[in-house]
């Protein structure tokens, strides 16, 4: 089943999706999708790459966050609404028959909740645990995974965890 | 044909304040993060603040965090930056410059103005 | 915080190739972009995400990057390539632009 991820309305939601180009910099299209992959492209395409950049977005709230050029092209969909909810397809096509890596996400998009995080925890907050609420320090915050960003280690993770507990800040965990 | 043309630079005694604009042409503004970059003279490049966008995110080089301001007006086309508390440090030639396609940073920047010149001295 | 380094400057003869190095730790890890700036004008893009180059930019332009070494080569080099070049990257730790300190290249005779 998909991974879910959660976001509250009016908040930005980040769905991981990466590959590790081989050779590096040898970039393949990727295509996201709102619904669960087909047998071939994505339906209801939201956002497009080519072999260099960004080529295609059908809407102006869906953004790569990510450095896709080093195959992070996680999908961030800024100012979430109720509608947003539902599966998302990130397809990596490969060149060749039936290569294509398929990855589907289920986001969950929901009403505000009334407990945030303390101020200062919430960069690394957003960081460190999908399906969880906060408020972003910049903005929108996002939903966000360790494994689609490079720069949080675990030690980090397990750190911020007791920092969560200690604040009194809600997780929710698939 | 992008264009970006900055405006508002000038001379201001320490402690002032100050307000860049960058008027955006020939492309869909509020499909770009968009960023001001400054340069000393005789220095440098030194990035100052970027902005999505929407301008629903901005940061800040800790240089200037807390006393500027970046923010955006997609219906009017223009990039602006609100200088408070100047400092002679500050003095430079502030470029806006256009971000990359599709890219919440923007990651490179693609396009240049040609740069207004701020001068922070008594 | 993340820091990148260039040679203050490099020589070069008319035709020869020049080579101008950007270093950081696993400098690799992340997309690099270069920037030509001539006296007076604003900075130009020559590459993007390590080797890409806008249109325009010749093809004498590449750009290379792996390990802690990012490169910008310009081959049969001209007078008219004189100018300063800056290296840049995104530290999507900090959510910073970060620039290298520059490297001005000089075309001798």
């Known amino acids: 089943s998909e991974v879910e991820y959660i976001a509250e309305v009016g908040q930005n939601a980040y769905l991981p999706c990466s590959y590790t180009p081989a050779p590096p910099g040898n970039l393949v299209p990727v295509c996201w999708g709102k619904g669960a992959c087909p047998v071939f492209d994505c339906s209801n395409v939201v956002l497009r790459t080519d072999n260099r950049d960004v080529n295609d977005r059908t809407s102006g709230r869906y953004w790569l966050k990510g450095d896709f050029h080093k195959g992070d092209v996680s999908l961030t969909i800024e100012n979430v609404t109720l509608a947003d909810s539902g599966v998302y397809c990130c397809r990596i096509q490969i060149p060749g028959i039936m290569n294509d890596e398929k990855h589907n996400v289920k986001l969950v998009v929901i009403k505000p909740a009334k407990v945030t995080p303390a101020p200062t925890l919430q960069r690394d907050l957003t960081s460190a645990f999908p399906r969880m609420l906060t408020t972003g320090e910049h903005g929108p915050a996002e939903t966000q995974t360790p494994g689609s960003l490079p720069d949080v280690n675990l030690t980090q993770i397990f750190t911020l965890t007791n920092e969560l507990r200690d604040s009194g800040a809600t997780i929710r965990t698939a | 044909e992008v264009q970006l043309l900055e405006s508002g630079g000038g001379l201001v005694q320490p402690g002032g304040s100050l307000r860049l604009s960058c008027a955006a042409s020939?492309?869909?503004?509020?499909?770009?993060?968009m960023s001001w970059v400054r340069q000393a003279p005789g220095k440098g490049l030194e990035w100052v603040s970027a902005?999505?966008?929407?301008?629903?995110?901005?940061y800040y080089a800790d240089s200037v965090k807390g006393r500027f301001t970046i923010s955006r007006d997609n219906s009017k086309n223009t990039l602006y930056l609100q200088m408070n508390s100047l400092r002679a440090e500050d003095t430079a030639v502030y470029y806006c410059?256009?971000?990359?396609?599709?890219?919440?940073?923007?990651?490179?920047?693609?396009?240049w103005g040609q740069g207004t010149l701020v001068t922070v001295s008594s | 915080s993340y820091v990148l380094t260039q040679p203050p400057s490099v020589s070069v003869a008319p035709g020869k190739t020049a080579r101008i190095t950007c270093g950081g730790d696993?400098?690799?890890?992340?997309?690099v972009h270069w920037y030509q700036q001539k006296p007076g004008q604003a900075p130009v893009l020559v590459i993007y995400?390590?080797?890409d180059r806008p249109s325009g930019i010749p093809e004498r332009f590449s750009g290379s990057n792996s390990g802690n070494t990012a490169t910008l080569t310009i081959s049969r080099v001209e007078a008219g390539d004189e100018a300063d070049y800056y290296c840049?990257?995104?530290?999507?730790?900090?959510?910073?632009?970060?620039f290298g300190g520059g490297t001005k290249l000089t075309v001798l005779g």
């Open positions: 410059a256009r971000g990359s396609y599709g890219t919440y940073y923007g990651n490179y920047f693609e396009y």
């Open positions: 020939g492309f869909t503004f509020s499909s770009y993060a």
């Open positions: 902005i999505s966008g929407s301008g629903g995110s901005t």
């Open positions: 696993n400098i690799g890890g992340k997309s």
């Open positions: 995400y390590d080797s």
């Open positions: 840049q990257v995104l530290d999507r730790r900090s959510d910073h632009f970060l």
